[in-house]
């Protein structure tokens, strides 16, 4: 059996973040059992976790991971140097910042060391797999009697991120949401002083520096409203 490695030729669906290849399945021997899919996420461009479902194996197997970057100066095959484990079985690999090259095609290969012919190769666009840390330091400023401005910080370059702000009052059953671009500022023009408001924000590595689909975690919520401090009506930020 020969391993098939898919090399993109420009005609693939470039919206896909990975291409998957595996061994031909012309028989049901151990060597042709499909390997689990590897999922990689780059956290705030600080480190990357590539994980797989180790429990999908018919018997506990310490699968090994190799990686390289296609058509680049970093095309030398590298072994995983920091495995992640689930119940003492390999279930992932963690790569550090210096090993992450966002705009080169990342090739990851999973292999069964007991059956070297049993392997699967995926190609990933890492810039589409970045998940930033949640926004921090939410603050509210009262711009006028009825207008609030929400600000926040991110632990990444602002211009690489877009944001989603959600807010609601204690009287609302659902959140109202608003998209915010890299300027990361949100104004609520009409605030009812009799209601208590809750705001939260999440961020995404899109569209300038990548095309990630996954959002960060939500920020801690921040509150404003009828039971807030009367001492300074122009600046009040209370974290839950």
């Amino acid at each position: 059996l020969n391993t098939t490695i898919l090399t993109p030729n420009g005609n693939e669906d470039t919206t896909a973040d990975f291409f998957l290849t595996t061994m031909p399945t012309d028989s049901l021997s151990v060597s042709t059992l499909p390997l689990p899919e590897v999922q990689c996420f780059v956290f705030n461009v600080e480190y990357m976790n590539c994980t797989w479902n180790s429990s999908s194996e018919p018997q506990p197997t310490n699968l090994t991971l190799h990686y390289w970057y296609k058509n680049s100066d970093n095309d030398k095959v590298q072994k995983c140097s920091h495995y992640l484990f689930s119940e003492e079985i390999t279930s992932g690999c963690q790569l550090q910042k210096k090993e992450i090259h966002l705009y080169q095609t990342f090739v990851v290969q999973l292999q069964d060391p007991r059956e070297p012919r049993r392997q699967a190769t995926q190609m990933l666009k890492l810039q589409n797999l970045v998940i930033p840390w949640a926004p921090e330091n939410l603050t509210l400023h009262k711009l006028s009697e009825s207008q609030l401005e929400l600000n926040w910080n991110n632990r990444f370059l602002n211009h690489c991120l877009e944001h989603l702000v959600q807010y609601r009052t204690d009287w609302d059953h659902s959140w109202t949401e608003q998209s915010v671009d890299y300027r990361h500022k949100f104004s609520l023009p009409s605030v009812d002083g009799q209601k208590r408001y809750t705001f939260r924000v999440r961020s995404r590595f899109n569209p300038l520096c990548g095309s990630a689909q996954h959002w960060s975690e939500w920020s801690h919520p921040i509150h404003w409203g009828s039971n807030t401090s009367k001492e300074n009506p122009f600046l009040f930020a209370l974290e839950a």
Epitope: N71, Y103, Q104, L157, H159, C160, C209
Partner: nanobody, 117 residues
Framework: QVQLQESGGGLVQPGGSLRLSCAAS????????MTWARQAPGKGLEWVST????????AYAASVEGRFTISRDNAKSTLYLQLNSLKTEDTAMYYC??????????PGQGTQVTVSS
Amino acid sequence: QVQLQESGGGLVQPGGSLRLSCAASGFTFSSYPMTWARQAPGKGLEWVSTIASDGGSTAYAASVEGRFTISRDNAKSTLYLQLNSLKTEDTAMYYCTKGYGDGTPAPGQGTQVTVSS
């Protein structure tokens, strides 16, 4: 190796215009976002603008928004920055960098923009 060659700077009066260019080689230009940054005399490197790899998205520092326009020609591996309504505070050395401007890729030699009457 990566090479970035900026050009197009010069001396211009306030309110004037310039078009900066950056010729790139040694990497797959069309795969990378590209960034312009600048350094005024005695100051640190300041991010100016970034453009997505396909040119479809752009971002600008508040100080230049509405006056500067970033663009790119992937077929020519060239990055541009159109500077309009120039102010004296725009005087700086302008650099293009590969990527989103995180400070890690070394910029090129730069091109000097001087705004003075």
